[in-house]
């Protein structure tokens, strides 16, 4: 029996559905009853879904697991994880075994879009060339960690006097909070940019200082 | 008749290596996983490691991964275990095991063992 | 992982029926087949039973297994001098814990 899994990682979002694919090449005349699928954690071996002795023995990780109960004797032994968290992600392996025996490991890369950023602006009045700004862009409830960039109004990147803070949540999202220092010219825009390096999503804010008033 | 004899036990100080050799004879022998289980002197049967036909993977007790490496040579009808790093607690007798038709059915051929001694 | 609990001595005289218990059959992957294996004084262990009942040829009907809940039993009867050996139950718990044998039981025939 020879195990097969995608190569590639399976990206899922949070609270989504992911199937973990999984298949092996049954023998002709091949039964359930022969049968024995084990889904586990590949680097803390816990059991995470199984199917022996004819079976379907459910899930054992959260409740959250399924199998694909009539394509199994198709030789498709793919994993349903349902309302995926932060938490799941890593590394599963599929184990087959009937006559022979083998296995293969799948990961799980877990993400999330960031929200449009907030910008924020201190001080926000009786602005003067010349003075001492401090922009915030804030940006929430996204996964993996986000990358930050930020540039002028002629796409110029902002480097210096740039402070980034990313703090996960009880769902392990991150709120990241990026604080850019400037001295201001006659005018100009400042524009940040969220980016999720999994999803490849880019979340962009911008505030533009033209005197008064100010626009977002 | 189906056949496993097993070869390359002795004495080994710690820390020491040893390579165990289990020559098959009398079925298919690339059509079957292949076993090694231990058994210290007046104490119970201990399972070691498995390997699938193909010997692409492979499985360990977790005394002895990271030290023990199980592989075969199905143009020889050979499976190996390779035991680096041994302890006291590695002596042992050393059987070999086929597997019946299904592999979670159990291990219906058995070598007569080989002997491990580890000790300074 | 699984831990299989078998007394570690059991006895009887020629010609009567003896019962070895395994307990401790709960595996966290489902499975409930259990295995048993012979071991004379000496030599290498034998497959006695699989998947709780079933005999390989060449072993005797003497030779028996059942399981209820977590349990699993091995009977011998007509119990012959020749029995006298070491038993072990076994049970496979996949990927997990490998195979998991149990503590042995040494049979003793007075």
């Known amino acids: 029996v020879e195990v097969q899994v995608s190569e590639d990682p399976v990206v899922a979002l949070v609270d989504t559905d992911a199937t973990l694919r999984c298949s092996f090449s049954p023998e002709p005349g091949f039964s359930l009853a022969q049968l024995n699928l084990i889904w586990q954690l590949t680097d803390t071996k816990q059991l995470v879904h199984s199917f022996t002795e004819g079976r379907d023995q459910g899930s054992a990780y959260s409740n959250r697991t399924a199998l694909f109960p009539d394509l199994l004797v198709q030789g498709n032994a793919s994993l349903r994880l349902q309302r995926v968290r932060v938490t799941d992600e890593g590394s599963y392996t599929c184990f087959v075994s009937i006559q022979d025996f083998d296995s293969a490991a799948v990961s799980l890369q877990v993400a999330a879009p960031y929200s449009k950023p907030s910008m924020t602006l201190e001080p926000n009045k009786d602005l003067r060339p010349g003075n001492m700004v401090t922009i915030t862009c804030s940006s929430y409830q996204g996964y993996p960690e986000a990358e930050v960039f930020w540039k002028d109004g002629q796409g110029v990147p902002l480097t210096g006097n740039v402070t980034t803070s990313q703090m996960a949540n009880e769902r392990g999202l991150f709120d990241v909070h990026s604080v850019l220092r400037v001295v201001l010219g006659a005018n100009g825009t400042y524009s940040c940019l969220v980016r999720n390096p999994v999803l490849q999503q880019d979340a962009h804010g911008s505030v533009t200082i033209t005197g008064q008033p100010l626009t977002f | 008749e189906v056949q496993l004899l097993e070869s390359g036990g002795g004495l080994v100080q710690p820390g020491g290596s040893l390579r165990l050799s289990c020559a098959a004879s009398?079925?298919?022998?690339?059509?079957?996983?292949m076993t090694w289980v231990r058994q210290a002197p007046g104490k119970g049967l201990e399972w070691v490691a498995d390997i699938n036909s193909g010997g692409g993977t492979t499985l360990y007790a977790d005394a002895v991964k990271g030290r023990f490496t199980i592989s075969r040579d199905n143009s020889k009808n050979i499976v190996y275990l390779q035991m680096n790093s041994l302890r006291g607690e590695d002596t042992a007798v050393y059987y070999c095991?086929?597997?019946?038709?299904?592999?979670?059915?159990?291990?219906?051929?058995w070598g007569q063992g080989t002997t491990v001694t580890v000790s300074s | 992982q699984s831990v299989l609990t078998q007394p570690p001595s059991a006895s009887g005289t020629p010609g009567q029926r003896v019962t070895i218990s395994c307990s401790g059959v709960t595996s966290k992957i489902g499975s409930k087949y259990v295995h048993w294996y012979q071991q004379l004084p000496g030599t290498a262990p034998k497959l006695l039973i699989y998947?709780?009942?079933e005999r390989p040829s060449g072993v005797p009907d003497r030779f028996s297994g059942s399981t209820s809940g977590t349990s699993a039993s091995l009977a011998i009867s007509g119990l012959q001098s020749e029995d006298e050996a070491d038993y072990y139950c076994?049970?496979?718990?996949?990927?997990?814990?490998?195979?998991?044998f149990g503590g042995g039981t040494k049979l003793t025939v007075l």
């Open positions: 076994a049970t496979w718990e996949g990927a997990l814990n490998g195979w998991v």
């Open positions: 998947r709780n009942f």
């Open positions: 009398g079925f298919t022998f690339s059509s079957y996983p």
């Open positions: 095991a086929k597997h019946l038709d299904y592999y979670s059915y159990g291990m219906d051929v």
